[in-house]
């Protein structure tokens, strides 16, 4: 039987300073149980950008309704785009534990920043 | 429409074992966590245990008792019960998980139970 | 563990009467609770899941309302099919998922 998938569609996505971007993510199951995080960059030093369950992330607001019934869209916007945004965002899939562990990650889709227009 | 069918419930002595199952149908079950809810005579729900793909997750009365499975290719829940005990007298309801945004898991559709009685 | 505290244990009510019962948890939950109906010799049913979303099917007159620690579930108008007994079960932090002890409504 088909393993989990975590389908990042875009490898890229260019995005005026200014604007919002909207990262793309999508997963085939419902299972295993545990959240989907995101991050910009990869390995031990990769930074935190949206966790549904705790944290303050005001820059973030999930695409799906928050009310969406077995959902496996986990897509995100990130408002007010800086250059400081620039890099490689993963949507990353762990699997319930104690501590939660991470199970699958997507292929990441790397975010440019271009100049404001104006 | 999704069908829950629990079987294998029965009158068993304290320390036998006992094999419960749940035949699923009406939605894609390979997707899907299930879990099983135990209800005491005359008492409230009690969760008994969850599995998702091979993760399981058990309540601390039944852990190192009871084993969770299933059978993807059958649409079948199974829960093994193992060391039984006067206790675990109770409906064993099989019940489908479902998921809301980012959370979960709930219980939105129940089978009808079936009842297991340990007692000498 | 979250603990689940249903009040009260038992309401009796006239046909027609506005029902409010009580689920108080140990700790914030956020909006991570459903609420369920049992008959007896029956099987639970979903109603309210996210605190406030009715489950499809479910009649307008219930209602959720609550988050954090505090949650409610109305039925604006009790119907003879109302008599049961109502479940709360908080899903923000688990295993072990939790119910609170019910809360049983009986014709007055």
């Known amino acids: 039987e088909e393993e989990l998938q975590v389908i990042q569609p875009d490898k890229s996505v260019s995005v005026a300073a200014g604007e919002s971007a909207i990262l793309h993510c999508t997963v085939t199951s419902l299972i295993p149980v545990g959240p989907i995080q995101w991050f910009r960059g990869a390995g031990p030093a990769r930074e935190l950008i949206y966790n549904q369950k705790e944290g303050h992330f005001p820059r973030v607001t999930t695409v799906s309704e928050s009310t969406k019934r077995e959902n496996m869209d986990f897509s995100i916007s990130i408002s007010n785009i800086t250059p400081a945004d620039a890099g490689t965002y993963y949507c990353v899939k762990f699997r319930k534990g104690s501590p939660d562990t991470e199970f699958k990650s997507g292929a990441g889709t790397e975010l440019s920043v271009r100049a404001k227009p104006s | 429409d999704v069908q829950l069918v629990e079987s294998g419930g029965g009158v068993v002595r304290p320390g036998e074992s006992l094999r419960l199952s749940c035949a699923a149908s009406?939605?894609?079950?390979?997707?899907?966590?299930v879990s099983w809810v135990r209800q005491a005579p005359g008492e409230g729900l009690e969760w008994v245990s969850t599995?998702?793909?091979?993760?399981?997750y058990y309540a601390d009365s039944v852990k190192g008792r009871f084993t969770i499975s299933r059978d993807n290719s059958k649409n079948t829940l199974y829960l093994q019960m193992n060391s039984l005990r006067a206790e675990d007298t109770a409906v064993y309801y099989c019940a489908k998980d479902s998921t809301v945004g980012w959370s979960g898991d709930f219980f939105d559709y129940w089978g009808l139970g079936t009842l297991v009685t340990v007692s000498s | 563990e979250i603990v689940l505290t249903q009040s009260p244990a038992t309401l009796s009510v006239s046909p027609g009467e506005r029902v409010t019962f009580s689920c108080r948890a140990s700790q914030n939950v956020r909006s991570d609770i459903a609420w369920y109906q049992q008959k007896p010799g029956q099987a639970p049913r979903l109603l309210i899941y996210?605190?406030?979303s009715r489950d499809t099917g479910i009649p307008d007159r219930f209602s959720g309302s609550g988050s954090g620690t505090d949650f409610t579930l109305t039925i604006s108008s009790l119907q003879s099919e109302d008599f049961g007994v109502y479940y709360c079960?908080?899903?923000?932090?688990?295993?072990?998922?939790?119910f609170g002890g019910g809360t049983k409504v009986e014709i007055k």
């Open positions: 996210a605190a406030s």
């Open positions: 599995i998702g793909a091979d993760d399981t």
């Open positions: 079960q908080q899903y923000y932090d688990w295993p072990p998922f939790t």
């Open positions: 009406g939605f894609s079950f390979s997707i899907y966590a």
